[in-house]
């Protein structure tokens, strides 16, 4: 397939979904914030869970006054369509509105580093993944997800935040990258392209996929997103590529069928809870992992990226709905909302499987050039 050097499931082949819009900044209520019996939070009044900053929506985070100790996902920047469809620029503009909220867009001036200096960091995301150069790391065990099958109630907030479509996740979705590496899911969002133009953020050997899903998580070592920003392993994102397949993806349809309701920037709707794990690939054992950053301002580093080897399949119609329904700022379509790939600058991407071993005729002598940093674990 398109990803020539990936083993077995054909390069990133086969069937699931992913994450975008990074954090949702932190509307995570602290454990003490249990609701009062007299008037506990309602279905849509989730304490600290509704407004997590998006991956791209990470502003200078401030707790909401009404909800002590929780941040809004919405307190993040806003996206516009990039100028160059294939390689959106790493630029943004910033306005002051209300409490110092930053506004940025894909492909504009001034450059993102002026919005957030971290965007000029050395270890940024997304990156191009070259399986042949990935370090096979047997210590990378299958991911563990618990509580991702949500009952239909309470309903979840689905929002067009101007730079992505973001689903705010309730507390209780637990994810482990390995022993002692535990996280709580905050939100998920998507990145996409435009008609005939792919829009994933990560690429594989230069190949860009139609779209990408990001599920953003906060380490259980931190109570709030702002505490975790920039701390190694403070945030973790599960990412999966979305590809075109012959059949409608029923899990994604539960979200895509509601996009018309939130076509306008800033609009939101409530959707029944669903099985969040069904939006991801079924194979949790084969993935790439590296340390990078949020892919939108504030571009905070220390984010652990886990990119599934297996892809998620959506129908052509579903991919079209994703890329052609939403509107962003200034009467522009919300399309091509991906950042250009960033240099590795010496980082080694690890693989949980021997991705460098290729059975295709192209590679005469497959070589594993990098060794696993966690080999001693």
């Amino acid at each position: 397939q398109r990803l020539p050097r990936m083993q077995e499931d054909s390069p990133l082949g086969g069937g699931s979904s992913g994450e975008d819009d990074p954090l949702g900044e932190e509307d995570l209520p602290s454990e003490e914030d249990s609701p009062r019996e007299e008037d506990p939070p309602g279905e849509e009044d989730l304490p600290g869970e509704e407004d997590l900053p998006g991956e791209e929506d990470l502003p200078e985070v401030k707790p909401k006054s009404e909800e002590e100790g929780s941040l809004k996902l919405e307190d993040l920047p806003t996206v516009e369509a990039p100028g160059d469809p294939q390689e959106p620029q790493n630029n943004a503009h910033r306005d002051k509105e209300g409490d110092d909220q930053s506004h940025w867009r894909y492909g504009g001036d001034p450059p993102w580093p002026r919005v957030s200096p971290a965007c000029a960091g050395r270890f940024q995301s997304p990156v191009d993944i070259r399986p042949q150069l990935a370090a096979f790391c047997p210590a990378l065990r299958p991911l563990e997800l618990l509580g991702f099958q949500l009952p239909p109630l309470p309903e979840l907030r689905l929002r067009n935040n101007g730079h992505s479509v973001q689903l705010t996740l309730p507390p209780g979705l637990e994810m482990a990258l390995g022993p002692g590496r535990e996280y709580r899911a905050l939100q998920l969002h998507l990145h996409w392209g435009a008609a005939g133009r792919p829009g994933s953020e990560h690429t594989v050997e230069g190949h860009r996929f139609p779209a990408e899903i990001h599920v953003v998580h906060l380490s259980t070592a931190f109570a709030r997103v702002d505490e975790a920003l920039g701390r190694p392993g403070g945030l973790a994102v599960l990412a999966a590529f979305l590809e075109e397949g012959p059949e409608e993806n029923s899990a994604y349809e539960q979200l895509l069928s509601r996009l018309e309701e939130i076509a306008e920037e800033g609009s939101e709707t409530q959707v029944p809870g669903l099985d969040i794990s069904a939006l991801l690939p079924s194979d949790f054992s084969r993935y790439f992992q590296y340390e990078g950053s949020l892919t939108t301002p504030p571009c905070a580093q220390g984010v652990i990226w886990t990119v599934f080897n297996q892809t998620v399949m959506l129908s052509a119609k579903q991919l079209h709905t994703l890329s052609d329904t939403l509107w962003g700022p200034g009467d522009s379509r919300l399309q091509l909302n991906f950042r250009a790939t960033q240099p590795l600058n010496g980082r080694v991407i690890e693989a949980s499987f021997p991705a460098g071993v290729d059975s295709s005729p192209r590679a005469a002598e497959p070589v594993q050039l990098n060794s696993c940093l966690a080999a001693g674990d």
Epitope: D39, G147, Q149, P272
Partner: antibody
């Protein structure tokens, strides 16, 4: 204070219909999902149906699907359960309950006083 | 029932009793929260514990909840006569269309 007051129960013949009402007060009704839970004489609790805060989404137990309809009128702060094609096994005390959202998990935090529905010829 | 509780438990005043709620990988073991309700004779149920181990205001700290794996439990210490009631656990089950599930109920008798 926060309360749910029920009305509409009674005796009905098999195949008949009945509508239960649940008037809410003391809280922002439209912000909460609501449910009906029933309890047959001498038995345990059984969830029957639920409706989202906006009324846009409804859910039913298999045992009542196609026969019962849950609805709400947020302007009147009232929850309804329309019960058609009633059977003897529907005989129970019916409770309306508020779904308090505690950390993303719905718990039935406020209950009505219950109303007895008896299906018998 | 997809979630099981003992039909009855008993204890003397001042003692500690526990009520178990045993589920499976499609309900409690899937990460769903467990809530507990107390139903005094002739009255409507009352929320006693939410989210596995949290007490609504007004519920005495003699009541506590815990959850581990596919089961949960309710503990009552310093048993009092007024604790005599039926107790129900409730969770969710992804394998059922009726996604809200209650345990069958446990009758607590204070000796």
């Amino acid at each position: 204070q926060v309360q749910l007051v029920q009305s509409g129960g009674g005796l009905v013949q098999p195949g008949g219909s009945l509508r239960l009402s649940c008037a809410a007060s003391g809280f922002t009704f439209s912000s909460y999902a609501m449910s009906w839970v029933r309890q047959a004489p001498g038995k345990g609790l059984e969830w029957v149906s639920a409706i989202s805060g906006s009324g846009g989404s409804t859910y039913y137990a298999d045992s009542v699907k196609g026969r019962f309809t849950i609805s709400r009128d947020n302007s009147k702060n009232t929850l309804y359960l329309q019960m058609n094609s009633l059977r003897a096994e529907d005989t129970a005390v019916y409770y309306c309950a508020r779904n308090g959202n505690y950390r993303g998990s719905l718990a039935f935090d406020i209950w009505g006083q219950g109303t007895l529905v008896t299906v018998s010829s | 029932q997809s979630v099981l509780t003992p039909p009855s438990v008993s204890g003397a005043p001042g003692q500690r009793v526990t009520i178990s709620c045993t589920g499976s990988s499609s309900n409690i073991g899937a990460g769903y929260d467990v809530h507990w309700y107390q139903q005094l004779p002739g009255t409507a149920p009352k929320l006693l514990i939410y989210g596995n181990n949290n007490r609504p205001s007004g519920v005495p700290d003699r009541f506590s909840g815990s959850k581990s794996g596919t089961s949960a439990s309710l503990a009552i210490t310093g048993l009092q006569a007024e604790d005599e009631a039926d107790y129900y656990c409730q969770s969710y089950d992804s394998s059922l269309s009726a996604w809200v599930v209650f345990g069958g109920g446990t009758k607590l008798t204070v000796l």
